[in-house]
């Protein structure tokens, strides 16, 4: 079986000119391909495999959300020569808010990574994007993780930063066929310049309070001393697929497949950093 | 139906510039990988630089690296190359290209660039 | 000097089949990036002839051909016709230039 053989990063890897072509191994019959697309409300970038791959043929779309960072995952496995090519690779630009009043800054700024390499997602030196409120939800959170893409062999991964809605979220995260998006939030503006080694504790648990030995008393009984149950502590949450995973498209949507004659089809794309909408 | 246009091509001495620019039409052009391609007289073809669908991720030929740079305005559909300390070697037809099934499927009809003292 | 080679030159006669080759090395079609072969008729702009190693864009006759194995490729031309005197150029990635890099191209003409 000869496969299409490429990885991308945000833009690079699989553009048409640097499409490679791979004899697979005796055994192997099938050639797989997987886009995952990732949309915060500043902008959009994929990363995708092709290559030999394994298992049985077939078709495997997925949509998640991690705090409203949006994913979308298609996973696609055939069984000729040269099929996995079908997928389109390119995350479209994200539509600029046409009324910019319509979604004022909320005050919040957060280092933003949509597409940037591990190097230039380091410390202070993304840019810094002002949060604003978008879909009927409060974007006052930053965010920093990963995004990973395993298939064929290879695993592809991406860091991930900007405005979600939970300000406190610790190593949370996503998964779908082959697809993990994880990472941590904090309060407060350009808070996500590094959270790779965050701690569970949050503003909303109450501290530690030293409390004053017990009054000496004539009745002997055994105290015991609980803190109160009115800020429970907040359960870290698991995977989240949507409520309906099937076929399920970001806001903006991920396109299936660009038509021959109008779109090239397999153009690498991440987009810039423009706001959303809807 | 898609269309590049090249303009911006002329007369130009040693050390001097230039700004090509290529109208794109027909297609969606924020989706597309695009490059400049250029040839001699009488000579074949050479690939000068390749800008991705989103302008961040920019190849060069060695031969132009450092003197030219590829740019895009994604909203107004068009792809630039300036060209700086032009030499006489850098004489040439400039031909926008499409990347688009596997390979640079459409060409625009090219721009004459004549570096001369 | 062409990263790609093939021969200058080539001819036949109306009906004859045509072979033209280009040698590359392990950096580009070697390395298994795929091939395209453009077509450019005097006085215009190049235009993609075969694509993908083998495959036609639309359009393009079936008289053209293209095949690859190891480090070269070759495009193929049955039923010769006048209006097929052009330069013919390969194409494909190079990894040690990080670009496409073209053959040096070859004339062909169309004898008698």
């Known amino acids: 079986l000869e496969c299409y053989s490429c990885v991308q990063k945000a833009d690079d890897g699989c553009s048409p000119n640097k499409m490679k072509t791979v004899k697979c191994a005796p055994g192997v019959d099938v050639c797989t391909e997987a886009v995952g697309a990732v949309e915060t409300i500043h902008g959009q970038f994929s990363l995708a495999v092709r290559g030999c791959g394994s298992g049985l043929p077939g078709k495997n779309d997925r949509g998640l959300d991690l705090h409203g960072l949006l994913a979308f995952i298609q996973l696609q496995q055939c069984a000729q020569d040269r099929c996995n090519a079908k997928l389109n690779l390119t995350s479209r630009a994200l539509d600029p808010a046409g009324n910019e009043s319509a979604y004022p800054p909320n005050g919040v700024e957060c280092y933003s990574c949509v597409g940037l390499s591990r190097e230039a997602c380091q410390g202070t030196s993304p840019p810094v994007v002002s949060c604003y409120n978008a879909s009927d939800h409060v974007y006052k959170g930053c965010f920093d993780g990963n995004v990973t893409l395993t298939a064929a062999n290879v695993t592809v991964s991406l860091p991930v930063r900007g405005c979600v809605q939970d300000e406190f979220c610790t190593r949370d995260g996503v998964t779908g066929p082959g697809f993990t998006l994880s990472g941590s939030c904090c309060q407060g503006s350009r808070c996500n310049s590094d959270l790779r080694n965050k701690t569970y504790f949050s503003p909303r648990i109450p501290p530690l309070v030293r409390l004053p030995p017990p009054e000496p008393t004539t009745v002997a009984s055994t105290t015991s001393v609980t803190t109160s149950t009115s800020a429970p502590v907040r359960p870290t949450s698991t995977t989240k697929p949507m409520p309906a995973p099937t076929s399920q498209t970001p806001r903006q949507g991920v396109e299936h497949e660009a038509s021959r004659d109008e779109e090239p089809r397999l153009t690498g794309g991440a987009a810039g950093h423009q706001d959303r909408s809807n | 139906e898609v269309q590049l246009l090249e303009s911006g091509g002329g007369l130009v001495q040693p050390g001097g510039s230039l700004r090509l620019s290529c109208a794109a039409s027909g297609f969606t052009f924020s989706n597309a990988w695009m490059s400049w391609v250029r040839q001699a007289p009488g000579k074949g073809l050479e690939w000068v630089s390749y800008?991705?669908?989103?302008?961040?991720?920019?190849y060069y030929a060695d031969s132009v690296k450092g003197r030219f740079t590829i740019s895009r305005d994604n909203s107004k559909n068009t792809l630039y190359l300036q060209m700086n300390s032009l030499r006489a070697e850098d004489t040439a037809v400039y031909y926008c290209?499409?990347?688009?099934?596997?390979?640079?499927?459409?060409w625009g009809q090219g721009t004459l660039v004549t570096v001369t003292s | 000097q062409s990263v790609l080679t093939q021969p200058p030159s080539a001819s036949g006669t109306p009906g004859q089949r045509v072979t033209i080759s280009c040698s590359g090395s392990?950096?580009?079609?070697?390395?298994?990036?795929?091939v395209h072969w453009y077509q450019q008729l005097p006085g215009t702009a190049p235009k993609l002839l075969i694509y993908?190693?083998?495959k036609r864009p639309s359009g393009v006759p079936d008289r053209f051909s293209g095949s690859k194995s190891g480090t070269s490729a070759s495009l193929a031309i049955s039923g010769l016709r006048s209006e097929d005197e052009a330069d013919y150029y390969c194409?494909?990635?190079?990894?040690?230039?990080?670009?496409?890099?073209f053959g040096g191209g070859t004339k062909l003409t169309v004898l008698g």
């Open positions: 194409a494909a990635w190079d990894d040690r230039l990080n670009g496409p890099v």
């Open positions: 993908d190693n083998n």
């Open positions: 290209a499409r990347e688009g099934l596997w390979a640079f499927d459409y």
């Open positions: 800008i991705s669908s989103s302008g961040s991720t920019i």
């Open positions: 392990s950096s580009n079609i070697g390395a298994g990036y795929v």
